[in-house]
Amino acid sequence: LDSPDRPWSPLTFSPAQLTVQEGENATFTCSLADIPDSFVLNWYRLSPRNQTDKLAAFQEDRIEPGRDRRFRVTRLPNGRDFHMSIVAARLNDSGIYLCGAIYLPPNTQINESPRAELSVTERTLEPPTQSPSPPPRLSGQLQGLVIGVTSVLVGVLLLLLLTWVLAAVFPRATRGACVCGSEDEPLKEGPDAAPVFTLDYGELDFQWREKTPEPPAPCAPEQTEYATIVFPGRPASPGRRASASSLQGAQPPSPEDGPGLWPL
């Protein structure tokens, strides 16, 4: 397995799991246990087909940037540690990364580090800070949600307006209606009363189950026309919130589970 004549050194690549928001810099550290006399250090991303795509390299005291200049390698003063950074990370930078060393004279076998996983999440809306800053760009899914909520509100207002107009134009139509059941009786939840809006956010599904209350059954004469106003349902009660176990993916990785330990 080994070529007995060529020196080599174990590599680590840390942290094992790194999460950054899009637009932020993502920095891994590739560490050599020892500095061999001559070596090439490569930074790779693992492709979906498990192939290593070279992002950047360090050779003979100089950095070799890859095609994408966002991928930068910096040698630290101790000579054994290398910062491997993605400048302004994008969502599609999420994936598996590693570093590898080739010892000179050329060796067909690359000495690879453990793998590390990068997760780039969508930028979330932050509360305004004291220093004025341009409003962050709404992500696609968030934008869709805002548009949807706005549309529902506009629809409800139009319905209210229409009902008011109908009541004003046809006052007889509203006279025969009565409501059966007491006010204290809880509203039933029918099978069709729970549309589920799912915002797919990485590995997590945060679900808001909108419980639309059924209107009380009207007891009106057959010939009476009436309008039913359906208000958007309130969010599920605390008892219906996602269980802790369903949100496990949101927990940070254990500090024990990584190829290297971050200094305190």
């Epitope: 397995l1 080994d2 020196p7 080599w8 050194s9 174990p10 680590t12 094992a16 560490s31 050599l32 246990a33 020892d34 500095i35 061999p36 101790n78 000579g79 054994r80 540690d81 076998q109 000495n111 690879e112 580090s113 453990p114 793998r115 254990s254 024990e256 589970d257 990584g258 190829p259 290297g260 330990l261 200094p263």
Partner: antibody, heavy 115, light 108 residues
Amino acid sequence: EVQLVESGGDLVKPGGSLRLSCLASGFTFSNFHMNWVRQAPGKGLQWVAFVNVGGIRTAYADGVKGRFTISRDDAKNTLYLQMDSLRADDTAVYYCARAFPGDYWGQGTLVTVSS
Amino acid sequence: SYVLSQPPSATVTLRQTARLTCGGDSIGRKSVEWYQQKPGQPPVLIIFGDSSRPSGIPERFSGANSGNTATLTISGALAEDEADYYCQVWDSNTKAWVFGEGTQLTVL
């Protein structure tokens, strides 16, 4: 909780063989380099063997080269040390440990080589 | 083969500073790890990468490495710090992990 549990230690005659196992739990075993380190009674720590992630590269202390073989089975989360042609000076507590950095160690298993 | 030299023993007065050394040829080019071992227990990593502390290790432990000497410093040593201390490096030429002989620290 990270745990490394060694097993397989025993009393064996000189020239005999033993296979030590180290079962890992609480972390992604396949993503770590691993070491076997031993400590003879009343002596210091002595590195024995190393295997990197993927099991592609191995390294051995001079005194055990050709007699000991380190291997790993990532599917079983287990590290192995096959010890052949055992000698009296191989008597020691054998520890398995994560390597670079050596942040977790097992409690050790005692190997006694004696006639 | 690569050799790491540690003094066999060292003594420090309670709450004083102890400096333990580990000598090796161009050790400054290597990543040094320090271990603490108490009787009947496995070693515990206290410094890695020359000067980094794993979580749970008290701040009084610090490390440095340059030239031919690596140093473990215990600032304000406590009775519980009485133990054996080992340094360790990887030597890429011999392709081996190397331990120092260990220093037995006594806290008076």
